[in-house]
């Protein structure tokens, strides 16, 4: 039961955050203008992934994609990237998680498959998660830098061809949006981990076998002592020798993992 | 690369008028501003007019009700009109476009001189 909670949870908070990673990609405030000692206030910009915007102070809104690429910074390209990757793969962790839910059926799939499949969603969407924090994180030292650079820029002199940029940007709430998103993408990651280890049946069965002597020969069947990992064939607790042989099972009631014969 | 071309500048009666005219050759991003600056000796650059890409106008207070900016998108030149001039009004004027492209980006002009005599 605690498992399937888990799993379930997992699941779920991994949808949320991949629905805020896509949110957050799609975002056109990445970064806002810094409106503090800018003497310019009949504009406000605020620019995302793919497109700049301006509010000017009638109200009317105008974007504009970015459509060069050769024009803009390796970062922003790398930012893209990661976002891109991290929906991919949490879709596809998502898409995964669904047949491993232990409350839903899928013809005769076993455990141990659905056990497979939650820990490579699990991982699928640490993956993710990671990948959106770190392209948000990637945007914000961008930012970090180019504000400090504004700054300085600012204060200097305008003798020439002076090409410095005037307006400061600071962090826009996509950047917010997206690391809520990935810490949740991670979470919910962790937990589908976590969950897999309560799925895979995981003790290893040694079965300890006690001969009983009688009357007639007991015959031994070559290759009936088998260890079973929970993933083999017996993994119902089968007696594999005939004759006086009978497993533990018959005779004590649950052996340890340490039982050997 | 963005180059602007200043014209206009020069000596001018206390009263009397000038109009300055900058020209931007290049490739320009659609969402911007283009407009004046000015630097006195001495002083910090302070805003004089802007005209945005989507219409909006602004003046800088010290010139509100004497001067007046225009733009030719077509052309991609903007235009300042002084009028009433004042000796406070000398100054280098600086040409500048900002563009809103990724980051932003500015561009300015080598700036002309106006000096306004007494």
């Known amino acids: 039961m605690a498992v399937t909670a888990c799993q379930g949870l997992g699941f779920v908070v991994s949808l949320i955050g991949i629905a805020g990673i896509i949110a957050a990609t799609c975002m056109d405030q990445w970064s806002t203008q810094d409106l503090y000692n800018n003497p310019v206030t009949a504009v406000f910009n605020y620019q995302g992934l793919w497109r700049s915007c301006v509010r000017e102070s009638s109200g009317f809104t105008e974007c504009r994609g970015y459509f060069t690429l050769l024009g803009l910074p390796a970062m922003l390209q790398a930012v893209r990237a990661l976002m891109i990757v991290g929906i991919v793969l949490g879709a596809i962790g998502l898409l995964v998680s669904i047949f491993a839910l232990k409350c839903i059926r899928i013809g005769s799939m076993e455990d141990s498959a659905k056990a497979n499949m939650t820990l490579t969603s699990g991982i699928m969407f640490i993956v993710s998660g990671l990948c959106a924090i770190a392209g948000v994180s990637v945007f914000a030292n961008m930012l970090v830098t180019n504000f400090w650079m504004s700054t300085a820029n600012m204060y200097t002199g305008m003798g020439g061809m002076v090409q410095t940029v005037q307006t400061r940007y600071t962090f826009g709430a996509a950047l917010f949006v997206g690391w809520v998103a990935g810490g949740l993408t991670l979470i919910g990651g962790v937990m589908m981990c976590i969950a897999c280890r309560g799925l895979a049946p995981e003790e290893t069965n040694y079965k300890a076998v006690s001969y009983h002597a009688s009357g007639h020969s007991v015959a031994y069947k070559p290759g009936g002592f088998k260890a079973s990992t929970g993933f083999g064939s017996n993994t119902k607790n089968k007696k594999i020798y005939d004759g006086g042989a009978r497993t533990e099972d018959e005779v004590q009631s649950y052996p340890s993992k340490h039982d050997y014969v | 690369q963005v180059q602007l071309v200043e014209s206009g500048g020069g000596l001018a009666q206390l009263g009397g008028s000038l109009r300055l005219s900058c020209a931007a050759s290049?490739?320009?991003?659609?969402?911007?501003?283009m407009g004046w600056w000015r630097q006195a000796p001495g002083s910090q650059r302070e805003l004089v007019a802007i005209?945005?890409?989507?219409?909006?106008?602004q003046y800088g207070d010290s010139v509100k009700g004497r001067f007046t900016i225009s733009r030719d998108n077509a052309k991609n030149t903007v235009y300042l009109q002084m009028a009433s001039l004042k000796p406070e009004d000398t100054a280098v004027y600086y040409c500048?476009?900002?563009?809103?492209?990724?980051?932003?980006?500015?561009?300015w002009g080598q700036g002309t001189q106006v000096t306004v005599s007494l």
């Open positions: 500048n476009v900002h563009t809103y492209d990724f980051l932003g980006r500015d561009y």
């Open positions: 290049g490739s320009i991003f659609g969402l911007n501003f």
């Open positions: 005209a945005t890409s989507g219409g909006s106008i």
